[in-house]
Each structure stands twice: as structure tokens, then as C-alpha cells.
């Protein structure tokens, strides 16, 4: 003969365990009803009857099977430099990540506590490690042969382009100006439509990125913005 | 855009029961609450109670619980408040709000707004 | 029930004042859940502040919040003659969800 289906509430056998989606309630020394996602326990379980579920009370919510007397609060409000990628739900708690242009600088378990802007390199200083969601641009000097003259957080630096006549010779901000009305092609990797080397100028391919020295950031502790390193604008 | 539309002006006799609705458009019914709030005549903003909509789930301040039923019809995008036993003391601008679920119960959209005036 | 007190009751300043206006809970109430609404003569009311400090979209930086526990206050930074109306405070920490008296502003 099958094995008796028991309902809760009942008295487990010693040494086993309550089943799946059940627990163990110490008061009443039953197995009884855990409450689904979306809901919290309002009146616990006894000898006699079982657990009474309730939903989560507006902005609070429950994401397993539970018997909490209480849902949990769900996050505030994202902060204008944040988009909500979850919805407080009685299910979900909201989520919060950082916008476009920024990056988190204090996550919390789901998405992001702190956000701050990425930093932007200042003309002659191009992305030496691009942002990503959890760190900043680190900036690096343009090498010789290459420039960047814009303030941005995703620009690198480029090759100048190689004049046959050289007007004003590049810097590390400002690409040569030639007088030539049609330059000849650089062959520098990655450079699209750039001029050809016939000056004496070694041909200059584009930096290889640094490794960062920036501060890892841990989670568990409050941290302020950082001072902008060199070649960074704060704007 | 989002619109809370209530029905007209109601003039009562002590006793009898009104009847207002407010229809929404402009937002999906789902994951909000829709709340009824009276403002008697110069006086304050009173919270009555409020319904989920997608579950029919009323919560009152007691102090309006026998008198006030609210209730919703999904299909018409339309939550209703009932008053019974009406005096005159019930006369007031009665308001639908709506506060989307996870906003902490801010209500961020009103209807207009209907007077219910309870006179012999 | 968490009653809410504000104060003043009514106030009567000039364009360009800085107006502050307090709500006082009976207990506790978490800064998510207090709101300020405005609400002109014979209009409805309309959400000015949420969750203590937040403006939703459309609403002027001359409006601030602040405040936490049982102490919260609404600042007008620089009063403007469309700033004539009755202002309420709202918990919703606690079923049932009370409202301040309200406090008038009028302009000199």
C-alpha cells in the first residue's frame, strides 16, 4: 500500500525532515506551510491548523517560500543618475543600476548603491581602459604620434595624420595639419582613413592600454568620489 | 498620458447611498492601488481606503469601513466608491488616486474630484 | 493611528521668502513613506515631494524635503506667487494612511 499523504499540519517521524515548501515550526512541533513568493506568514501554524498567508503589504516583498511575520521593504527610489532595470514587485525588490555614462562606485547585493560619472579624459589623454559597469576610465597620456583633442570618457588616442607637407606638426592634443590637399594614407593599425608615413616619423600605432591603478572598490564600504587622476576632467 | 476621470456631482437626501466611479486610462490597472480620499467642505484631505484592482483587496481606516464599499471593474478600467447611510456630515469632494505598487504610496495622479452634497 | 501635525496652520509670506513648513508624526514614520501635496482652490491635490526628498518630474528645485523619524519639513527656497495653496503632508507607514492638517500659504 502507498504511503499515507499527511497534510499539514503534522508531526514529523523522528529523524526525518519536513518536505519540500514546509518547516519545522518549534512552537507547534509540526511541519507545516511555508507561504509562496509575494506573501509572508500572518498567523503561524499550531497543533491544529496551518499557516495563514497574507500578501506583501505595498512596496515589501517575499522572494522565496517563507514564514517571515513580515514581508521585506523593497529599496527606495532610484536616483536620477540610476534607471530601474527591476520593478518593486511583491515578488522582486526593485533594482537600480547606473545610467549610461556612469558606473557603479558601491554596489549593494542586486544592483547599485553609489553611482558616479565616468571619467573623462582631457584633450592629449585618451581611454586607456574603457568604464565598465563597476569601474572607471583610466586615461593615459597620448604617446608620441598621437593625439586626442576631445574631453571624453570613450575616445582613445589616434595616430596624426603623416603629411607629405607638414603645416603645423601634431601634438599629444591637436592632429598635424598638412598642407598638401590630399594626403597619403596611414597604414597604423586600427586608424581608419589616415594618412600614409612619408615623413621621416616612425609610423606610431595606437598605445597599449596601462594596467589601472585605481582603488578596487569594495562594496562594503562607503567611499567618496576620487580625486580625478592626471589627464581627467571632473565635469 | 495617464487620466483619472470621475463621475459628476451627486445631491442626496440624509439616508440614501451614492454611487462614484473614476476611470483610468493612460496606465495598465496591474501593479497599482487606486485610493478614495473626501475633503469636506474648507477642511482637510481624509485617506478612506483603498482597493487593488487586480485582486479586488480593500483595506479601510476603520472609521470608514461600514460605510464605505469600494470595489473595481478590470474590464472598464473603472474603480467605484459607495457610500451608505448618508448624512450630512458626509457632505464632501470626494477624490480617486492612484499609487503605483513600490512608490511607497505616493499618489502621483488624482481625479478630479466629485462633490457629493447630502441635503433634506 | 500616527497622527500628523503641521505647522504652522497658515502663513503669510513675500515672492522671493524662504518658506519651511513641519510635519510631525505621532511615531516613527521610514522616509520612504511621507509624501507633500499641493493643492490650489478648488483644484485637486497633486504631488509635490515623495519619499521625503524626492520632486517627481515637472515639480520646481525651489521645492525641498528633508527630515526622518517623527521631524520632516518642506522648504520653499524662493516663494513664487503660483505657490498660493494649502500644503499636506501624508504617511503611508502605518494603515490607516493619515494626512497633516495642512498648512496655508498666501502671498503678502
Known amino acids: 500500500l502507498p504511503a499515507q499523504v499527511a497534510f499539514t499540519p503534522y508531526a514529523p517521524e523522528p529523524g526525518s525532515t519536513c518536505r519540500l515548501r514546509e518547516y519545522y515550526d518549534q512552537t507547534a512541533q509540526m511541519c507545516c506551510s511555508k507561504c509562496s513568493p509575494g506573501q509572508h506568514a500572518k498567523v503561524f501554524c499550531t497543533k491544529t491548523s496551518d499557516t495563514v498567508c497574507d500578501s506583501c503589504e505595498d512596496s515589501t516583498y517575499t522572494q522565496l517560500w517563507n514564514w517571515v511575520p513580515e514581508c521585506l521593504s523593497c529599496g527606495s527610489r532610484c536616483s536620477s543618475d540610476q534607471v530601474e532595470t527591476q520593478a518593486c514587485t511583491r515578488e522582486q525588490n526593485r533594482i537600480c543600476t547606473c545610467r549610461p555614462g556612469w558606473y557603479c562606485a558601491l554596489s549593494k547585493q542586486e544592483g547599485c548603491r553609489l553611482c558616479a560619472p565616468l571619467r573623462k579624459c582631457r584633450p592629449g589623454f585618451g581611454v586607456a581602459r574603457p568604464g565598465t559597469e563597476t569601474s572607471d576610465v583610466v586615461c593615459k597620456p597620448c604617446a608620441p604620434g598621437t593625439f586626442s583633442n576631445t574631453t571624453s570618457s570613450t575616445d582613445i588616442c589616434r595616430p596624426h595624420q603623416i603629411c607629405n607637407v607638414v603645416a603645423i606638426p601634431g601634438n599629444a592634443s591637436m592632429d598635424a595639419v598638412c598642407t598638401s590637399t590630399s594626403p597619403t594614407r596611414s597604414m597604423a593599425p586600427g586608424a581608419v582613413h589616415l594618412p600614409q608615413p612619408v615623413s621621416t616619423r616612425s609610423q606610431h600605432t595606437q598605445p597599449t592600454p596601462e594596467p589601472s591603478t585605481a582603488p578596487s572598490t569594495s562594496f562594503l564600504l562607503p567611499m567618496g568620489p576620487s580625486p580625478p587622476a592626471e589627464g581627467s576632467t571632473g565635469d | 498620458q495617464v487620466q483619472l476621470v470621475q463621475s459628476g456631482s451627486e445631491l442626496k437626501k440624509p439616508g440614501a447611498s451614492v454611487k462614484v466611479s473614476c476611470k483610468a486610462s493612460?496606465?495598465?490597472?496591474?501593479?497599482?492601488?487606486m485610493h478614495w480620499v473626501r475633503q469636506a467642505p474648507g477642511q482637510g484631505l481624509e485617506w478612506m481606503g483603498r482597493?487593488?484592482?487586480?485582486?479586488?483587496?480593500?483595506k479601510h481606516d476603520p472609521k470608514f469601513q461600514d460605510k464605505a464599499v469600494l470595489s473595481s471593474d478590470t474590464s472598464v478600467s473603472t474603480a467605484y466608491l459607495q457610500i451608505s447611510s448618508l448624512k450630512a456630515e458626509d457632505t464632501a469632494v470626494y477624490y480617486c488616486?492612484?499609487?503605483?505598487?513600490?512608490?511607497?504610496?505616493?499618489?502621483?495622479?488624482w481625479g478630479q474630484g466629485t462633490l457629493v452634497t447630502v441635503s433634506s | 493611528d500616527i497622527q500628523m501635525t503641521q505647522s504652522p496652520s497658515s502663513l503669510s509670506a513675500s515672492v522671493g521668502d524662504r518658506v519651511t513648513i513641519t510635519c510631525t508624526a505621532s511615531?516613527?514614520?521610514?522616509?520612504?513613506?511621507l509624501h507633500w501635496y499641493q493643492q490650489k482652490p478648488g483644484k485637486a491635490p497633486k504631488l509635490l515631494i515623495y519619499s521625503t526628498s524626492n520632486l517627481p518630474s515637472g515639480v520646481p528645485s525651489r521645492f525641498s524635503g528633508s527630515g526622518s523619524g517623527t521631524d520632516f519639513t518642506l522648504t520653499i527656497s524662493s516663494l513664487q506667487a503660483e505657490d498660493a495653496a494649502t500644503y499636506y503632508c501624508h504617511q503611508y507607514h502605518r494603515s490607516p494612511w493619515t494626512f497633516g492638517q495642512g498648512t496655508k500659504v498666501e502671498i503678502k
Open positions: 511615531s516613527s514614520v521610514s522616509s520612504n513613506y
Open positions: 482597493i487593488d484592482p487586480a485582486t479586488g483587496n480593500t
Open positions: 488616486a492612484r499609487s503605483p505598487y513600490g512608490d511607497f504610496g505616493a499618489m502621483d495622479y
Open positions: 493612460g496606465f495598465n490597472n496591474k501593479d497599482i492601488y
